[in-house]
Amino acid sequence: KIDACKRGDVTVKPSHVILLGSTVNITCSLKPRQGCFHYSRRNKLILYKFDRRINFHHGHSLNSQVTGLPLGTTLFVCKLACINSDEIQICGAEIFVGVAPEQPQNLSCIQKGEQGTVACTWERGRDTHLYTEYTLQLSGPKNLTWQKQCKDIYCDYLDFGINLTPESPESNFTAKVTAVNSLGSSSSLPSTFTFLDIVRPLPPWDIRIKFQKASVSRCTLYWRDEGLVLLNRLRYRPSNSRLWNMVNVTKAKGRHDLLDLKPFTEYEFQISSKLHLYKGSWSDWSESLRAQTPEEEPTGMLDVWYMKRHIDYSRQQISLFWKNLSVSEARGKILHYQVTLQELTGGKAMTQNITGHTSWTTVIPRTGNWAVAVSAANSKGSSLPTRINIMNLCEAGLLAPRQVSANSEGMDNILVTWQPPRKDPSAVQEYVVEWRELHPGGDTQVPLNWLRSRPYNVSALISENIKSYICYEIRVYALSGDQGGCSSILGNSKHKAPLSGPHINAITEEKGSILISWNSIPVQEQMGCLLHYRIYWKERDSNSQPQLCEIPYRVSQNSHPINSLQPRVTYVLWMTALTAAGESSHGNEREFCLQGKAN
């Protein structure tokens, strides 16, 4: 009720707190001598529900029956209206609409750690829309009882503040929660448990790992636990993995040997604890320990390939290339690669350690039989050496793969296909597909890529280091013992018409014909593999169609003769380049007049 209603009263029957769906009677009555000019028939009493007029009556009192009130609080205000004056407030009252509490469900109690306190949680059920008090009761052996009340509005948790001890771990305790509000009360089903049921150990702490003799195979995990812990769960995984390895151990006493860790790998370790085989719950997982396992000597062997280049009559350049070992094969940080070059007949050998590179170039005599061995070394040792006899990889024409083709296969992939060599195909021990960006002038600094293919394969998808709009020189080698044959082709993953035409840099006259020389189109403007050049010419100031000569593209070619020009006629000449996607724009125009005699 609004405090200090001097002019009258508002009363609510049967109660100002009602169950949802109930009906109430509201009465507004004026106190003596509080009406309009003391004439009661002029009194107009008006009942408002908040700000909405719901009833009125002339006289000293007003009765109203109200139904359908919503959950929550509704304010009713009674006002008096007299002729020729504003309405004045007489009094007011709130009606509280709610429901009785539902039975609390799923009561469960837990004690975090042996030194913790007992706390219980439950589900309240639907909101009552009234102040609802919860009382939690715990009874134990020897008629001991504890009780705690919750004054919080949405109460579903209470901590007794008492600690259960393991003196009699099988003793029974019973918890019950009761909800009470103005419309009723309800109690949960009792929950009965023992010390072992509800104590949830603290997670293990102070986790450490030790590797005996810096070896991954002798690894022990150490941790600290509460005194009564019987079981532990260990989980561990490489830091870059989402999947855990799980181990259950009993009576570990704070240590466990791990036997299946990989070398030189960062792991994450976590441990959880439990007091009893089948009672109680697991602790939370401990904080993670991150640790790197020690190195072990590399396993596996390097994939090695090579290129030979003729220098002069007595010398040749050998370029060796190798691929990094996988992380699981390297088993540590590779400190250097050891390359040994040996002349097989004379026994001369030279060894070199290479750091920071996966290639090595040297010059050797063209005579003799040469072999190389390459291995990778980390702090613990070296991989087994990969041995290769240096031979002429393309010498055996009968071993050359046939009908080599290279076709674009989606984004940044090229599918290379071939037919086995004419010579007995079963003699092929393996194919090697090699590719490198095509650079006019055969630049030896261009990175080399390769993959190995089994002898029964006649195709390979190359995708490593493949860029769009770049032309690659692709070779397929067939290897058989100490012989090799090869075939090559140009290929690209994506192409379009070149961005520019060749630049004519000179036109010279030779015996009645001309020789045109040009600069290659920059690689970044070729937009794929060039197929042809076209040379166009027409008489200056003529509107006739130009004549043209189409030349198949060859990497090293940058000049071509034309012998169909008339003497003493001035011609305009230009060039274009073509890929499979189309023709470039014109290169520069040059004028030329042949001085020689007419044929």
Partner: nanobody, 115 residues
Amino acid sequence: QVQLQESGGGLVQPGGSLRLSCTASGNIVSIYNMDWYRQAPGNQREWVASITSSGDPYYDGSAKGRFTISRDNAKMTVYLQMNSLRPEDTAVYYCKVPTEKGNYWGQGTQVTVSS
């Protein structure tokens, strides 16, 4: 037990504005209405505005169109924004939380509208 503390009152010229605040202690207020009342000298305390727990506002005729009530349950605070103030709005303004166990009132904050 709920305590209520009003603030924001003061002297303002006719036509001016004030914003009153009322902060509660004890989170039970979030399920109840929060109300503003006022009491002018020599008069009884009268209702001005209410806001339900779900945020629905209601106003007495004298406040409608000029006053706005709002609440912030996280801060357990109710506000009354008063615009176009008139001399007859001069009063002590009280905040109230009605519960089925009884009403909780603040101490009040004085609003004076005068030129």
